[in-house]
Interface confidence: medium
């Protein structure tokens, strides 16, 4: 059947895809949607209850932030 990603495995995969950038379990409001009233899509809905690939996971990485020196 389709591969699903849940729980700690989901967090681990997000860390792989997003690196230390961080991630959200819900897309920021309005992300990828033109409708202000569109229901917020969660990564558990998309990747645990259904299947998703690494590119889909990338959509839940934290948005860009100003670069800082190490």
């Amino acid at each position: 059947g389709p591969e699903t990603l849940c729980g700690a495995e989901l967090v681990d995969a997000l860390q792989f895809v997003c690196g230390d950038r961080g991630f959200y379990f819900n897309k920021p409001t309005g992300y990828g949607s033109s409708s202000r009233r569109a229901p917020q899509t969660g990564i558990v809905d998309e990747c645990c209850f259904r299947s998703c690939d690494l590119r889909r996971l990338e959509m839940y990485c934290a948005p860009l932030k100003p670069a800082k020196s190490a």
Epitope: E3, C18, D20, L54, A67, A70
Partner: antibody, heavy 115, light 104 residues
Framework: QVELVESGGGLVQPGGSLRLSCAAS????????MSWVRQAPGKGLEWVSY????????GYADSVKGRFTISRDNSKNTLYLQMNSLRAEDTAVYYC????????WGQGTLVTVSS | DIVLTQPPSVSGAPGQRVTISCTGS????????VHWYQQLPGTAPKLLIY???KRPSGVPDRFSGSKSGTSASLAITGLQSEDEADYYC?????FGGGTKLTVL
């Protein structure tokens, strides 16, 4: 100490298949995601595939999607890469690497695709 | 797609300091942490620096990493002949093209 040992490489004709293995020891195998990374002769590193630590999720580079399958056997501490429909451009040394930062690597196994 | 650019080669004399750059964009290096790998001739890669500037245990403090803006750098001080190797930067699952370090 952490040890990753790849095997299964060899010479195969275009269109053929090969199955690589990576035997792990020295760490809690079932706690780490794993990846395969390859290196064509004289070239740089290219990530190939990822598998979550329980094995329920996999990811692939576009260049191998639909042809390669990653899997793991957590009872044997072993990672696999089933490679089908091999092409000349798949010729490379294949490494298994641990975790999300690739903190440990195996010694590699050479796959040569040639007629 | 993410592209990380490294110089193909750098060189230095024993005892010198050399730096290897890794350039991307604000949407990758500017946002993600960078890791560095060392690959000695004929051997597998080894994690050298992770999360921009952290050294795994066993890596000499002659090796250091930094990140500023859209570029990351690996610095090697007190260059030694055994440092001659290929060096790769990476963010998540993407690698730079690699830099060959020659010790003169």
């Amino acid at each position: 100490q952490v040890e990753l040992v790849e095997s299964g490489g060899g010479l195969v004709q275009p269109g053929g298949s090969l199955r690589l293995s990576c035997a792990a020891s020295g760490f809690t195998w079932s706690s780490f995601a794993m990846s395969w990374v390859r290196q064509a002769p004289g070239k740089g590193l290219e990530w190939v595939s990822y598998i979550s630590y329980l094995g329920s999720y996999t990811g692939y580079a576009d260049s191998v999607k639909g042809r390669f399958t990653i899997s793991r056997d957590n009872s044997k501490n072993t990672l696999y890469l089933q490679m089908n429909s091999l092409r000349a451009e798949d010729t490379a040394v294949y490494y298994c690497a641990r975790g999300t930062k690739f903190d440990y690597w195996g010694q590699g196994t050479l796959v040569t695709v040639s007629s | 797609d993410i592209v990380l650019t490294q110089p193909p080669s750098v060189s230095g004399a024993p005892g010198q300091r050399v730096t290897i750059s890794c350039t991307g964009s604000s949407s990758n290096i500017g946002t993600y942490d960078v890791h560095w790998y060392q690959q000695l001739p004929g051997t597998a890669p080894k994690l050298l620096i992770y999360s921009n500037s952290k050294r795994p245990s066993g890596v000499p403090d002659r090796f250091s990493g930094s990140k500023s803006g859209t570029s990351a750098s690996l610095a090697i001080t007190g260059l030694q002949s055994e440092d001659e190797a290929d060096y790769y930067c990476s963010i998540t699952r993407v690698f730079g093209g690699g830099t060959k370090l020659t010790v003169l």
